[in-house]
């Protein structure tokens, strides 16, 4: 019989969504083409289930790691990259004293046991988000 | 493969001027900052400061401000440090090194070094 | 600018005996995101510093697993669980919490 496999190799399972981990770094906007060109998006978190999660994969690897967020269009205004704003509910997730825009921090990475705004230039790892695939019927 | 290779030796003289390079490969420049650190004949590990490749902000350790100045070319993939007022005490080997900020900060790929003599 | 301190300076060893180096910060590297910004570097005879160590405990990736991180706040270990002969050098420890970096005197392994 066929199983069905709602998310590629590599990419991890959770509440509907497909999830992949990068193993090496790009600059935040590079992060972005790296994954629209797996047909999927730097993470937007929509829950707070799901920032859990992410913010779990993250710190357990102990790597420091691009989402899909930004004030690049406007400083002190947070967006997500499918143009949503952020929630002010969501920014209890910054570390303490973040974001502080030191020299121009323009893009939020998953750090340690929070998010950190840093430079957009800098080469990190990142995580792409796609929907998982039907496997009913 | 990631490398950094620096200039060679030099002689200098007191009071005259040094400029080290530092030519990055197998990676992108722009991603990661580039610091200076020195070694004294014998001694320990000195920080002099970084640059960041992409926009060239500099931060530099308060001993060496005024007297060392960090630049790169992005077209050319190189970093340069050069340092002025040259004592006796500045002789040293001088290292570039790549900060990965995928892993904190870490100084994960060095250059090999470059001897810098300061003698009269 | 926050000082470093190593011990022991000089650290004699046995092949397949364990060893181990204190590093000491003046003010903790403790960091609001959780992670201690301490690392680890070994500079063989001859040779440009390598990395072992980074956030404190964190092997970086082809360093081999008889060595070791731990610590928090003020005060680190780095621990050889087996030493090997390719283990000498001068191990030194660098906080990167804050500019300027600064790292420890180093201590010099030497196999007895």
């Known amino acids: 019989e066929r199983l069905c496999h709602p998310c590629p190799w590599e990419w991890t399972f959770f509440q509907g969504n497909c999830y992949f981990m990068s193993n090496s770094q790009r600059n935040w906007h590079d992060s972005i083409t790296a994954c629209q060109e797996v047909g999927a998006q730097l993470v937007v978190i929509k829950s707070a289930e799901e920032q859990n999660f992410l913010q779990l994969q993250s710190s357990r690897s102990n790597r420091f790691t691009w989402m899909g967020l930004s004030d690049l269009n406007h400083e002190g205004t947070w967006q997500w990259v499918d143009g949503s704003p952020l929630l002010p509910s969501f920014k209890q997730y910054w570390n303490k004293g973040e974001p502080n825009n030191v020299g121009e921090e323009d893009c939020a990475e998953f750090s340690g046991n929070g998010w950190n705004d840093d430079k957009c230039n800098l080469a990190k790892f990142w995580i792409c988000k796609k929907s998982a695939a039907s496997c009913s019927g | 493969q990631v490398q950094l290779v620096q200039s060679g030796a030099e002689v200098k003289k007191p009071g005259a001027s040094v400029k080290v390079s530092c030519k990055a490969s197998g990676y992108t420049f722009t991603g990661y900052y580039i610091n200076w650190v020195r070694q004294a004949p014998g001694q320990g590990l000195e920080w002099m400061g970084w640059i960041n490749p992409n926009s060239g902000d500099t931060n530099y350790a308060q001993k060496f401000q005024g007297r060392v100045t960090m630049t790169r070319d992005p077209s050319i993939s190189t970093a340069y440090m050069e340092l002025s007022r040259l004592r006796s005490d500045d002789t040293a080997v001088y290292y570039c090194?790549?900060?990965?900020?995928?892993?904190?900060?870490?100084?994960?790929?060095w250059g090999q070094g470059t001897l810098v003599t300061v003698s009269s | 600018d926050i000082v470093m301190t190593q011990s022991p300076l000089s650290l004699p060893g046995t092949p397949g005996e364990p060893a181990s180096i204190s590093c000491r910060s003046s003010q903790s590297l403790l960091h609001s995101n959780g992670y201690n910004y301490l690392d680890w570097y070994l500079q063989k005879p001859g040779q440009s510093p390598q990395f072992l160590i980074y956030?404190?405990?964190n092997r970086a990736s082809g360093v081999p697993d008889r060595f070791s991180g731990s610590g928090s706040g003020t005060d680190f270990t780095l621990k050889i669980s087996r030493v090997e002969a390719e283990d000498v050098g001068v191990y030194y420890c660098m906080q990167a919490l804050q500019t300027p970096y600064t790292f420890g005197q180093g201590t010099k392994l030497e196999i007895k």
């Open positions: 956030l404190g405990s």
């Open positions: 090194a790549r900060e990965n900020s995928g892993y904190g900060k870490l100084f994960d790929y």
